[in-house]
Structure formats: C-alpha cells, structure tokens
Amino acid sequence: MAPWPELGDAQPNPSKYLEGATSQQPITPDKSKETNKTDNTEVPVTKFELLPTYSTATLIEEPTEVDDPWNLPTLQDSGIKWSERDAKGKILCVFQGIGRLILLLGFLYFFVCSLDVLSSAFQLVGGKMAGQFFSNSSIMSNPLLGLVIGVLVTVFVQSSSTSTSIVVSMVASSLLTVRAAIPIIMGANIGTSITNTIVALMQVGDRSEFRRAFAGATVHDFFNWLSVLVLLPVEVATHYLEVVTQLIVESFHFKNGEDAPDLLKVITKPFTKLIVQLDKKVISQIAMNDETAKNKSLVKIWCKTFTNMTQMNVTVPSMANCTSPSLCWTDGIQIWTMKNVTYKENIAKCQHIFVNFHLPDLAVGIILLIISLLVLCGCLIMIVKILGSVLKGQVATVIKKTINTDFPFPFAWLTGYLAILVGAGMTFIVQSSSVFTSALTPLIGIGVITIERAYPLTLGSNIGTTTTAILAALASPGNTLRSSLQIALCHFFFNISGILLWYPIPFTRLPIRMAKGLGNISAKYRWFAIFYLIIFFFLIPLTVFGLSLAGWPVLVGVGVPVVFIIILVLCLRLLQSRCPRVLPKKLQNWNFLPLCMHSLKPWDAVISKFTGPFQMPCCCCCRVCCRVCCLLCGCPKCCRCSKCCQDLEEGQEAQGVPVKAPETFDNITISREAQGEVRAPDSKTECTAL
C-alpha cells in the first residue's frame, strides 16, 4: 500500500493546500491570534516536509477548507458576564466553579485509578503469556526479538515498569545480559505509548477533537518508533548505551537509597487496592522459567503473611544430598533429610472485591478490563465536558496563552525545553508516563494544548519515567542494584538520545508531522485509528516475533523484501512530491496501482458494510445516553443528540455543513460557531452549563 492514501487525483497545485509550500509561516497559526507563535517559528518548510500533515484523502473528498484544522478552536463564553451578575448570581457562580473543580478532580482521580485497574486487568489477561515471552532463549542473540518482546509484554501488561522490573530481575539473576536487555527496554518504551492512544480513541465522537487528540497521542508513538528505528541499529553496532551506562555504574559507589517516593499512588492505591491486588512476582517467576509459578494465580489472596524459619523434613535424590549422614533417613522408598525451610504462614486476607470469588485470572481480567474501560471512557467524557464548560472566554485565553506561548525573543527556543522539564516533573509526580500522557490527550483534543506544545511535554514525560526508574533502582537491594541501575540508565540515555534526534532542530520534528498526517487520516476514516493500533502494537511485533522464532534466515528472507518495498515506496513518494518530472508519467502518481492499494476509500466501504448492522443499536444507545446526560446537566432540548446517527451526519455533509460526529459532550456554542451561526446566548437555550 502506498504510504499516504488518496494520492490519486490529488490537486494539481500543491501550493494551494500545502502549509508553507511557498512562504515561511508559523507552525500553528491561530486565526484568533490568541496564541503567539510556538517555539522555533519562522522555519522554512518545504512541500515535502509538511506533506504528511494533510491526508490527501481529505482534499479529494471534502471541499478545501480555508481554516487550518490544526488551529485551536475558539472557545466562546456563552455565559453571563461577571459584571452583569447580581450578588446571588455571583455566589451561585462561585459555588458552581467550586463544584466543577471538585467534580473535575473527582473524575480525574477515577480516571487515574481506572488506568491503574486497566493495567492490572491487562496483566491478568496477558501477564502469564507475557512472562513466557521472556523465557525465550533467542532474546540473547536477536535484538529484534528483544525489541518486539519488549513491545508485546508492555502492551499485554499495560505497564512498562512491570516489564522493566522483569528484565531487571532476569539480568540480576544472570538469565539475561545487559546487552540483550537494552532492546527489550526500547520495546517497553514503545509499548507504554499505547495507553494514551487508547485514551485518544475515547474522543472518537468529534472529528476535529479526535484529529487533535489522536495526533497528540500518536506523537508519542512516532517518537518512540523513530527513536528505535535509528538507535537500535546504532546500539547493535556500537553498544554505546551499554558502554556509557557501565562506565557510570562503575564510577560511582552507590549505597542503597530509600524507596522512590510514591506520590500519586498514595492517593490512588487505597481505592485501587479495594478493587484488585496482584502478585507481580508471578510474572517475573514465569519469565525466569519457574514451573511452579505457571499454576499460581496473579490475584493476591493473602496480604498479611508471616515468614518463619523452621526445620522441615524434605526428600532428597540421594544420600549425597543429605545435610549430614545422621540427619538422613528413609521411609522405605524415598530418602529424607532435615533442612531449614522458610515457610509462609497466611495471616490476613486482602480486602479487594475478588478475594473470595476464586475466579480464574482470565475471568477477573476480562471483568476488570470491561469495567476499567467503561470508567475510563466515562471519566474522560465528563472531564472533557467539565473542561469544555470551564475553559471558555477569558479563562481559555489565559490558559491557552500560558501553555502555548513562547518566551520573548531571543529566548523563544527555550520554551520547548522548559516544556520537557515540566513534562518530566509532572511525570515524576504522578510516577507514570501513561497517566501523564493520558491526561494530556483530552486537553489536546479540546484544544487547550497544541500538538507542538504537547510534543515536548511528552518527551519530558519519557524522561520523567526514567528518573523514577533510576530512583527505584537506587532503592533496590544490593543484589539487583547494579543491574537495575544500569538498565534504568540505559532507558534514560535512550530517551535523551531520542530527544537529541527528534527535537532540537525543528526540521527533525518528524513525529509531529507524522502524527498530524495520521490524525487527518483517522479523523476521516475513524476505523483506521484502531487499524493503526492493531498493526503497530500487535501485528508487526507478533509477526517479527514469529519470524524471529523461525530463525535468522526466515526473518531476513521475509524482512529484506518488505524493507526494500517500504524504501522503494518512500523514495518514489519523495520523487513524486519533490521532482515528479524525473519519473515516467505513469509513476508520477499512484493511479497505476489498484485503488485499494493507494486509497482507503474502498477499504472504508468494506468496513462500513461490516459495521453497518451495529451502527443502529449504537446510535440508539448514544441517543439515550446523550439525553440522560443532557437531563443530568440541565441542558435543554438544543442538545443535538440526533446527530449521533451516521445518516444524519451524511446528510449534513451533503449540505456542506462541517461534520461533527457522535458526541455526548457537545458545547452548543462551539457547534454553532463551527456552522457560522454564533449568536447571543438565550437563557433558554444555553447548553454550556454543566
């Protein structure tokens, strides 16, 4: 398939639709001038560089928009001005504000808790299988296999810290070398970026919102994939991460520190441990080929245990294994001896929901997966709804200016680096890059943060999660201190290297352009988002895993032609956009290929055929939910629940109305503004109140 869909019949004059094709302009121009230019403005951008930003699919099937879809929306304040309110109204407004803040914090709390439970659910569903990935002996010799194992395990357990801690324990017990562990860490870095991509899917209702949210989430994915694409071969060739980290570890005489501070967990743990508690050691034991662990449940039953040392009678293979001849005897069949054995006495059961159900791990995992996704989705909807009602007018202007504005000249370039530090700091506070980037995603979606600003925040988040790992490593026991510290440092320097590759020079900020390109495609064909997720996080890693197991000859035999085709397509794409005259007429576009190979339109038709029967019940459900939501929020009938249906959406599209797809948390003012019919709010029809 050609890299960018709908290339055939593309507009003949690219300069009409390509940002910066002929002129220099800021990366995120804002028609309302609410935001100043972002960092590194006035950058010469060629046609080729920004081409992925716009799906040419949009160009063919939709009229060319004058507005840049990546501009932040103007959030109009449709409420009564403060000065116009009476005393009662002001008090009411203050209480409303406090109420919204409390609700926002509450939903944010449950959002973070649901992410934690989601991780537990994934571990219950796929944890044991993930553990078994590690017990593959080929990891040692095949860095590519290590990489995909890192991706798959982290995707299955939804926690890079779990996969990293397995790697640490394997290195500490000499089952894995640091060299073999580095690709796994790189893979874990990729795998952890799936969480905020899943969160972005929750905003699929509103096309423009989804475009921004999905691009904002996948900028993390692309950064990680591109970093690995460059740094894995470099590491395999030079072992620079291994060497540098080894020098650091050896040059310091570390003493065991205190435990890394649990900051956010202090608040969330009391709640999440009432839902489920897991015995994370089981996955590690499976990874370390412990046969007994395979039959153990991941669900923790006993939380309070007493470990006691006692002399116990145990069987031994022969008299040679006896502690001493006088402490050996037989029962007639087996030889017994007395050994000091530590045994665990169960004292108190855990206090979570599943402690007395004795359900299989898979069942508990599926239950928690469904519940956590529902809570995650619900919380996200409510967070966006509350933010939508709060972030209007002056508030929005102040926030957007604060977040997206650069420092004054000549320090504008420093803004991005400050954002990296903020991202690292925030991640250190919440102790999880997944939580931070997932919280960032809806903010990008509703237009509070630009993708250009979200990018350094995300990069900072990557750094933040490694500093947490370094602290955790310093707190680890003596036997694992060296290995855990070296691995944490490898993780840290890998992310630093990635930032140096894909951030300092604006031209190299490929992840932003790639994410925007994907955002455009996914906004038009929303199924493509799921397709992307499955392909990048499951199919490709599983295929590489399977081919790696088959051996190097098979991997090379399949991989080389695939890589060759990709390079060929990219070169052709480059020539088509830069100097098409060099190419024969036939190769100047992709029309020589069947439509399904260079356009998503035929695929869309096929998928629509399959998903069609499910759309009607979905639509009804959406309408009911929306109506209930409107009633709860005190919105009048102006809430456009009817737009849930695709047929209505298509009807609007036919009339040339910019489409807003199924959404349960619409702001009527924004909707009207989008249709160019913003008018003074009528007290009867005001829908912005929560």
């Epitope: 050996c328 005897w329 037989t330 029962d331 069949i333 017994w336």
Partner: antibody, heavy 119, light 107 residues
Framework: QVQLQQPGAELVKPGASVKMSCKTS????????MHWVKQTPGQGLEWIGA????????AYNQKFKGKATLTADKSSSTAYMQLSSLTSEASAVYYC????????????WGQGTSVIVSS | DIVMTQSHKFMSRSVGDRVRITCKAS??????VAWYQQKPGQSPKLLIY???TRHSGVPDRFTGSGSGTDFIFTISNVQSEDLADYFC?????????FGAGTKLELK
C-alpha cells in the same frame, strides 16, 4: 480406625507363585507407604520392600528382588505382594504394614498371611 | 546393610521391675530407630519412633533413648501384659533392618 486385613493362610506348591492381598480401610490409601515384612522363627523380621500407592513407586530389599513384586490398586485400597518360584524357604508369615508419613517406622500392621510351601 | 544387634535374646523380670533392652547399630543411624512389641500369636505393634518419641496410645512407662549407634528401650514398671518380644528397627537407609528381638519373660 486404621485396619489392614490379610488372608490367614496360603498353601502353595514349590515353584508356584502366590499373590497375597492387604485390604486397607480407615485412612487415605494413597498417602502412606505400604511395607511388606517376612517373619520366620529362625530369621526374625525381614523387610521385603515397600510401595507408595499414590504413584506406584516401589523399593525392594536386594535379597527379595525378582522374588517379590509389589502392586497397589487405588480403587479398592488394596496392596498386593506376589511371590514367585516358591521354595520351602519362603514358608513364613508375611505382614503388610503401613509406613508413617515421612519416615520408615510402621505404625499399623496386618494380621499376617501364613504361607506354607509344600508339595 | 546396617545390622541391628540386640545383645539379649531373653530377659527375665518380675512385675514392677525396670527393664532396659539395648540395640546396637553397625553404623551411625542418627535417631532413625523404632521399637516394636510383638505378643505371641499377634502382629508387631509400634511403641517408639525417632528413638525417643512414643506412638499414640502407648503408656508412658515405655521410653526410648540413644542416638548414633547405641539405643536403649526401657520399661520402667513392668506389667504382666508386657510379656512379649521387643524388636528394634533402623530406617536410616534401605534396606530397613530389624534386630533379632529380645523376649521379655516373667520370673
């Protein structure tokens, strides 16, 4: 209570074989070893071997290897000992005895089967 | 094979007396020794295991002592029902072996 029942006597011809039983009750048959002991007036008590009914694992006294075969039927909680190629020296009382878990002391004994080898 | 030697084939005691039956192992058996009582026409009955531990239901006049190679079985207050053969047995290693037995008779 734990009981081990053995048939009183067996009269066999020289060169023939005999299969004696030991039916157990009052405990979980598969958890303890079952020992077989031979008693003759001249030789005293001699350990023949043991079987672990749970897995069918056996151990024999070298002196009785090839002579005695121990088996166990979990469904009927019965242990068996087959003695082959009998000679007059095999005439004795044969006891089955339950082994205590984890060591070789025998806490419950059957009444014994008296085997008389005579033509 | 470990040989268990009971030096006295017969021992004669009056009711109320104290009797000490000895048993010597040909090599160190730790404490893996059991003592049995066999009354005429009956099967053996376990009295002591681990050289010193009384089996359930065994009167406390029966005691065992010793470790390594030398073991002693004591009946502190002989009763008429104690007339029987007494065997020691080692279970330190296979094959399990018994002593020849000591017959306790009443004077």
């Amino acid at each position: 209570q734990v009981q081990l029942q053995q048939p009183g006597a067996e009269l066999v011809k020289p060169g023939a074989s005999v299969k004696m039983s030991c039916k157990t009750s009052g405990y979980t048959f598969t958890t303890n070893n079952m020992h077989w002991v031979k008693q003759t007036p001249g030789q005293g008590l001699e350990w023949i071997g043991a079987i672990y009914p749970g897995s069918g694992a056996t151990a024999y006294n070298q002196k009785f290897k090839g002579k005695a075969t121990l088996t166990a039927d979990k469904s009927s909680s019965t242990a068996y000992m087959q003695l082959s190629s009998l000679t007059s020296e095999a005439s004795a009382v044969y006891y089955c005895a339950r082994g205590m878990y984890g060591h070789g002391a025998m806490d419950y004994w059957g009444q014994g089967t008296s085997v008389i080898v005579s033509s | 094979d470990i040989v268990m030697t009971q030096s006295h084939k017969f021992m004669s005691r009056s009711v109320g007396d104290r009797v000490r039956i000895t048993c010597k192992a040909s090599q160190d058996v730790g404490t893996a020794v059991a003592w049995y009582q066999q009354k005429p026409g009956q099967s053996p009955k376990l009295l002591i295991y681990w050289a010193t531990t009384r089996h359930s239901g065994v009167p406390d006049r029966f005691t065992g002592s010793g470790s390594g190679t030398d073991f002693i079985f004591t009946i502190s207050n002989v009763q008429s029902e104690d007339l029987a053969d007494y065997f020691c047995q080692q279970y330190s290693s296979n094959p399990l072996t018994f002593g020849a037995g000591t017959k306790l008779e009443l004077k």
